[in-house]
Structure formats: structure tokens, C-alpha cells
Interface confidence: low
């Protein structure tokens, strides 16, 4: 792989509404805006709606998210886990449009990938994705 | 090819890094069939909070 990070996006895509729905970042330091409907009750992982075996999923209850969870202080629990994911799409060609988040191609690819993740992580614990970046492979 | 990098958010305690990777890898076949996407070189890691979107100092699996 070569090249530095090209285009990037800081929108959150969540599974509360349609797959196209995005929300504006809450702040520059935390580019996630957690949907309010996730803050009502503790969530457990619905194993029947995932593609993993029930034995490998975690059914622990989690504390509800509240506005106080949005602190940037590392000492406080946010009630949110973040994971960085990287992968290659080998049958897709990188072009200059993917360096510019304003292009239709960039936005379409971002939307398609967002929708794909909404299919993968269907359980209640999934809050969304952010900071999509594309670079040449 | 195109390298895609992104950050996923989950309610704390609902999933771990292994299951994030497992579910994504299980979906690769479906992505190939449904959308004609060939996905490879999957890497998942925890992001400490607060994270810097630009830092990417991660321990890849």
C-alpha cells in the first residue's frame, strides 16, 4: 500500500433510521453524535440478529448513554467503545475523486460502505461509524 | 485497490475487538455475492478514548 490518507469524513451513520441518515459531528474532538434513542435503556447484544455464534457474543448490559457521557476527560467512562477498522477493496480502483470528500463518487462510496456496515452490525449495540478515509492500496 | 479506514462505535460492553473482526470477516462472502466486492487485509483494533482521528497509533491484529 502506498500514499497517505486522502479523503476523510467525520459523519456518524447510525442504525436508528434509514441507512442514508447522517448526523453532524458533535465536536471536532469527538466526531460522533450518538443518536438519542440509544440512551433510553441498557442494551444487550441480540445474538439472533448477528452472524456470530451465540457463544461468542457478549450479553452484558451496559449503562445508558447520557449527555454527561460526552466528556472528553479520559478518566470518565463514555459508555462507548471505539474500534479502528482497515480493509482493502481489491476490485475497486482508487482515483483522484476519492481524495475530495465533495465529489459524488466519494460520497457514494462513503454511503455504500456505511450501508454495508449497517448490515454487518445489526445488533442494538452498534452506534455508527465515522472518519471514513480512502487511500490507494 | 482502495484502502478503507474508519472508526466504529458500539455501546460499551456489547462487543469486543475479536467479535468486531469476526463479524466483518463473516460478512466478506456476502459482500462478494451481494455487491461484487472483494474485501481483504482486514485489520481491527481498539481505539482508546478520547481518540484522535488522525493519530492511528493502533496495534493491528
Amino acid at each position: 500500500a502506498s500514499g497517505s490518507a486522502s479523503g476523510s469524513a467525520s459523519t456518524l451513520v447510525h442504525n436508528g433510521t434509514s441507512a442514508r441518515a447522517t448526523t453532524t459531528p458533535a465536536s471536532k474532538s469527538t466526531p460522533f453524535s450518538i443518536p438519542s434513542h440509544h440512551s433510553d435503556t441498557p442494551t444487550t447484544l441480540a445474538s439472533h440478529s448477528t452472524k456470530t455464534d451465540a457463544s461468542s457474543t457478549h450479553h452484558s448490559s451496559v449503562p445508558p448513554l447520557t449527555s454527561s457521557n460526552h466528556s472528553t476527560s479520559p478518566q470518565l467512562s463514555t459508555g462507548v467503545s471505539f474500534f479502528f477498522l482497515s480493509f482493502h477493496i481489491s476490485n475497486l480502483q482508487f482515483n483522484s475523486s476519492l481524495e475530495d470528500p465533495s465529489t459524488d463518487y466519494y460520497q457514494e462510496l462513503q454511503r455504500d460502505i456505511s450501508e454495508m456496515f449497517l448490515q454487518i452490525y445489526k445488533q442494538g449495540g452498534f452506534l455508527g461509524l465515522s472518519n471514513i478515509k480512502f487511500r490507494p492500496g | 485497490s482502495v484502502v478503507v479506514q474508519l472508526t466504529l462505535a458500539f455501546r460499551e460492553g456489547t462487543i469486543n475487538v475479536h467479535d468486531v473482526e469476526t463479524q466483518f470477516n463473516q460478512y466478506k462472502t456476502e459482500a462478494a455475492s451481494r455487491y461484487n466486492l472483494t474485501i481483504s487485509d482486514v485489520s481491527v483494533s481498539d481505539v482508546p478514548f478520547p481518540f484522535s482521528a488522525q493519530s492511528h497509533h493502533h496495534h493491528h491484529h
Epitope: 439472533h48 440478529s49 452472524k51 475497486l92 455504500d112 | 462478494a32 455475492s33 451481494r34 455487491y35 461484487n36
Partner: antibody
Framework: EVQLVQSGAEVKKPGASVKVSCKAS????????IEWVRQAPGQGLEWMGE????????NYNEKFKGRVTFTADTSTNTVYMELSSLRSEDTAVYYC????????????????WGQGTTVTVSS | DIVMTQSPATLSLSPGERATLSCRAS??????????IHWYQQKPGQAPKLLIY???NLETGIPARFSGSGSRTDFTLTISSLEPEDVAVYYC?????????FGGGTKVEIK
């Protein structure tokens, strides 16, 4: 040879439930989605939803959510579609179909269909 | 939901004529270059039969007089030279978004 064989015709009263079976053969059952599509008399085709037999994962058309349930028995390679609270508008031919890749180039599509099961809802 | 609109509702042609059937989606059915639209033929009393998958790929065993074209929202099924056995109803199906949706169908008949 890929085959999907469905259960026989049913006559039901309004409010009752019906369970249609679809037995698959001639291919590896577990990794292929099974779609359910219905067709009212003289009307077009309507997608009801799908099930992935290996995991039991389902996707439903919101129109039928709460009334329809798909299940799969991997020991007999059979998928079931149960529709409850039947009304006269549910009178239709119900098809199961495989979402498979018997196409050249590895592209997937709904390629093999069952013969259809006629469900008549009448008081 | 994605609405699939087929036209015309009925097409009456003589044997040997070219049939052009249209299918329009209310939004793009393309994902990363692949058009997730399929064409089916249904004869009376029979189950639908796959003709074209992913907009333009001819299913194995289907005569070469059938072809598909189009991208994103506008698609066409063409029968280059109509045969008597082509009398049927033709449906397009989008598998881009759940719920999958069919067009209302085009009935092809011989004059």
C-alpha cells in the same frame, strides 16, 4: 440439479395461520439465502423476505413484519414460511426461491424457484 | 422503499420484431459499479424464470436474443427478434435495498 419443492395447496379461514414448506436439494443448503415471494391472483410479484439457513438470519418486508416468520431446518434442508392472522388479501401463490451463484462470473441472483404453493383464505 | 416502474404495461408485436421493455427505479440501484437489478420472465401458471442478472448479464441457457442494459435508475430489457414462445409477463427486480421490490410487469403478446 438444484430443486426447490414446496408443500401443497392450502385453504384457510380468516384469522388462521398457514405454514408453507420449501425443501431444497441439489446444492449446498446452508450458505444460500432463500427468498419468499408471493403473487396474488392476476397481480404482480411481491417480496416478503428472506432467510439464511446456516445462521437463521432473516430480513423481512416491513409490510409483513409481525405476521410472517421464516425458519430453517438444516437437518432436512427445509425452509418454512408461516403467515398468521390470515385475511382474504393473503390469497396468493407463495414462492420460495434461492438467491444463488449458478451464474457465470460468480454474480448472485434469485436463480431457482419452487413451483409455488397456492394459499386460499376464505370463510 | 425503492419503487420500480415498468413500461409499457402491455406490448403487442409481430414475430420477428424487436421488443424494448423499460424499468425505472425511484433511486439508484447501483452499488460500487454493480447494478443490482434482474429481469424475470413468467408464463401463465409457472414460476418466474431468471433471464438477466445484474442489469446486463445473460443467465446460462437463456437465448441470446435477450439482452439487458442500463445503469443506476434506468434499465432496458430487449428481445431482438420476438418469438412466439416469448409471450409472457416480464418483471424487473431490485436487490439493492431491503425490501426488494419488483416492477409491476410488462405483458408481451403477439399481434
Amino acid at each position: 440439479e438444484v430443486q426447490l419443492v414446496q408443500s401443497g395447496a392450502e385453504v384457510k379461514k380468516p384469522g388462521a395461520s398457514v405454514k408453507v414448506s420449501c425443501k431444497a436439494s441439489g446444492y449446498r443448503f446452508i450458505p444460500y439465502w432463500i427468498e419468499w415471494v408471493r403473487q396474488a391472483p392476476g397481480q404482480g410479484l411481491e417480496w416478503m423476505g428472506e432467510i439464511l439457513p446456516g445462521t437463521g438470519r432473516t430480513n423481512y418486508n416491513e409490510k409483513f413484519k409481525g405476521r410472517v416468520t421464516f425458519t430453517a431446518d438444516t437437518s432436512t434442508n427445509t425452509v418454512y414460511m408461516e403467515l398468521s392472522s390470515l385475511r382474504s388479501e393473503d390469497t396468493a401463490v407463495y414462492y420460495c426461491a434461492r438467491y444463488g451463484d449458478d451464474t457465470s462470473g460468480g454474480y448472485y441472483a434469485v436463480d431457482y424457484w419452487g413451483q409455488g404453493t397456492t394459499v386460499t383464505v376464505s370463510s | 422503499d425503492i419503487v420500480m416502474t415498468q413500461s409499457p404495461a402491455t406490448l403487442s408485436l409481430s414475430p420477428g420484431e424487436r421488443a424494448t421493455l423499460s424499468c425505472r427505479a425511484s433511486e439508484s440501484v447501483n452499488i460500487l459499479g454493480t447494478n443490482l437489478i434482474h429481469w424475470y420472465q413468467q408464463k401463465p401458471g409457472q414460476a418466474p424464470k431468471l433471464l438477466i442478472y445484474h442489469a446486463s448479464n445473460l443467465e446460462t441457457g437463456i437465448p441470446a436474443r435477450f439482452s439487458g442494459s442500463g445503469s443506476r435508475t434506468d434499465f432496458t430489457l430487449t428481445i431482438s427478434s420476438l418469438e412466439p414462445e416469448d409471450v409472457a409477463v416480464y418483471y424487473c427486480l431490485q436487490s439493492r435495498k431491503i425490501p426488494w421490490t419488483f416492477g409491476g410487469g410488462t405483458k408481451v403478446e403477439i399481434k
